[in-house]
């Protein structure tokens, strides 16, 4: 990366990463309180960062109580994929499953969890573990939302006007300014589900010399600042 060579370049960056874990196994306390009967269902919306590894869990039922374990995977624009394990015959079966990055964590008779290696945007979707017992089924479903960190740039494009861009984030980032100026924000939607947010602000008041662009995103926050100088803007980019 190029080093800053004038005052219009990136001056400071503060990061606050919101997601550290790629395991989608919820804190047990949250989900067990109302989940002591068969035929119970728990659904969770869960954001996961792109390029991490994700692990999704079934309900906590011992193998000795089970007949069949099935993972049902519904991804956008694809037929439903199922991965099933039948305990009696100790066999696994897959239907319409083409993504080799989505696999059992280990042998299903040892661990019923599902793993996604190197999460991609295409892994957005619904994942459900169905545990079949002699007395009914237990379900645990995940609405998986893949998060993509936007690339953030801040530059001055004309006299006392600054442009802050959060490029190709998922979901869309939110941009705010300190101090507030006369701002216009535009969003551009890409075919892969990412969004570019561009905020252009003008400060008429001449006693404002430094402005800060704050980008908020589920993957973390970033603050950039520049000095407003009457020169053409150089440009700086940074990842969250």
């Amino acid at each position: 990366a190029a080093q800053p060579n004038n005052s219009l370049m990136l001056q400071t960056s503060k990061e606050n990463h919101a997601l550290a874990s790629s395991s989608l196994c919820m804190d047990e306390k949250q989900i067990t309180q109302n989940y002591s009967k068969v035929l119970a269902e728990v659904n969770t919306s869960w954001p996961v960062k792109m390029a991490t590894n994700a692990v999704l869990c079934c309900p906590p039922i011992a193998l000795r109580n089970l007949i069949i374990i099935t993972w049902e995977i519904i991804l956008r624009g694809q037929p439903s994929c199922t991965k099933a394990y039948k305990k009696e015959t100790n066999e696994t079966k897959e239907t319409n499953c083409t993504d080799e990055r989505i696999t059992w964590v280990s042998r299903p008779d040892q661990n019923s969890d599902l793993q996604i290696r190197t999460v991609a945007i295409t892994h957005d979707g619904y994942y459900r573990c169905i545990m079949v017992t002699p007395d009914g089924n237990f379900h645990r479903g995940y609405h998986l939302q893949v998060l993509v960190t936007p690339e953030v740039t801040l530059f001055q494009n004309r006299n006392r006007t600054a442009v802050c861009k959060a490029v190709a984030g998922k979901p869309a980032a939110h941009i705010s300014w300190i101090p507030e100026g006369d701002c216009a924000t535009k969003q551009e939607y890409w075919s892969n589900g990412t969004v570019t947010v561009k905020s252009t602000c003008h400060w008429e008041v001449h006693n404002v010399s430094t402005v800060t662009c704050h980008v908020s995103h589920l993957t973390g926050n970033k603050s950039l600042y520049i000095e407003l100088l009457p020169v053409p803007g150089a440009k700086k980019s940074a990842k969250l």
Epitope: S23, C25, M26, D27, E28, K29, T32, Y35, S36, K37, V38, A40, V55, C57, C58, P59, P60, I61, A62, L63, R64, N65, I67, E88, N111, S112, D113, T133, P134, D135, F138
Partner: antibody, heavy 119, light 110 residues
Framework: QVQLVQSGAEVKKPGASVKVSCKAS????????MHWVRQAPGQGLEWMGY????????NYNEKFKGRVTMTRDTSTSTVYMELSSLRSEDTAVYYC????????????WGQGTLVTVSS | DIVLTQSPASLAVSPGQRATITCRAS??????????MHWYQQKPGQPPKLLIY???NLESGVPARFSGSGSGTDFTLTINPVEANDTANYYC????????FGQGTKVEIK
């Protein structure tokens, strides 16, 4: 409501066998795994093994393998635990306990059967 | 096999005070986001009674004075405040394919 009723106390001689029964009611008998646990006088709980009435699967604590046999009779909703080659240290209260699916916890227990092994 | 070690072996507590029992497993009993550790209470002449399941979940009908915590290898059962009828033996239990109990903790009320 769920009930597990065990057979009465037994007195056996060393070397003999004992068969304790546990009759289940109030639920679908074949749907839940049944465990057996014993407790010697003044001692703690010791897991012996389980039987799954759905498919007749069994799994025994290594300590009792070769001496313990767990069976079930679906017509009477009863599970049995037979312990052979009895010795004095087998004197204990024997419990059956039903395993609930979620969390594999034991929510229901029989009242216990005292087996005394004495010459 | 996983060995569970409870401490203390016995405990005398005054009514209204807090009683804390710990259970340490020889290896982790947590998997897939769950800790397969349960706590039982046993009074003389009675079968054990389930208090806490999956480390921290209160069984239906059990007073909220009982609580459980922990993950991995270290777990705690807390009774707060203790009442006179809490005199009993308390056992931790791990439920995997092979099951084990702690050796028990005798709680007496002063």
């Amino acid at each position: 409501q769920v009930q597990l009723v065990q057979s009465g106390a037994e007195v056996k001689k060393p070397g003999a066998s004992v068969k304790v029964s546990c009759k289940a009611s109030g639920y679908t008998f074949t749907s839940y795994v049944m465990h057996w646990v014993r407790q010697a006088p003044g001692q703690g709980l010791e897991w012996m093994g389980y039987i799954n009435p759905y498919n007749d699967d069994t799994n025994y604590n290594e300590k009792f393998k070769g001496r313990v046999t767990m069976t079930r009779d679906t017509s009477t909703s009863t599970v049995y635990m037979e312990l052979s080659s009895l010795r004095s240290e087998d004197t204990a209260v024997y419990y059956c306990a039903r395993e609930d699916y979620y969390g594999s916890r034991w929510g229901y227990w029989g009242q216990g059967t005292l087996v005394t092994v004495s010459s | 096999d996983i060995v569970l070690t409870q401490s203390p072996a016995s405990l005398a507590v005054s009514p209204g005070q807090r009683a804390t029992i710990t259970c340490r497993a020889s290896k982790s009993v947590s998997t897939s986001g769950y800790s397969y550790m349960h706590w039982y209470q046993q009074k003389p002449g009675q079968p054990p009674k389930l208090l806490i399941y999956l480390a921290s979940n209160l069984e239906s009908g059990v007073p909220a004075r009982f609580s459980g915590s922990g993950s991995g290898t270290d777990f705690t059962l807390t009774i707060n405040p203790v009442e006179a009828n809490d005199t009993a033996n308390y056992y931790c239990q791990h439920s995997s394919e092979l099951l084990t109990f702690g050796q028990g903790t005798k709680v007496e009320i002063k």
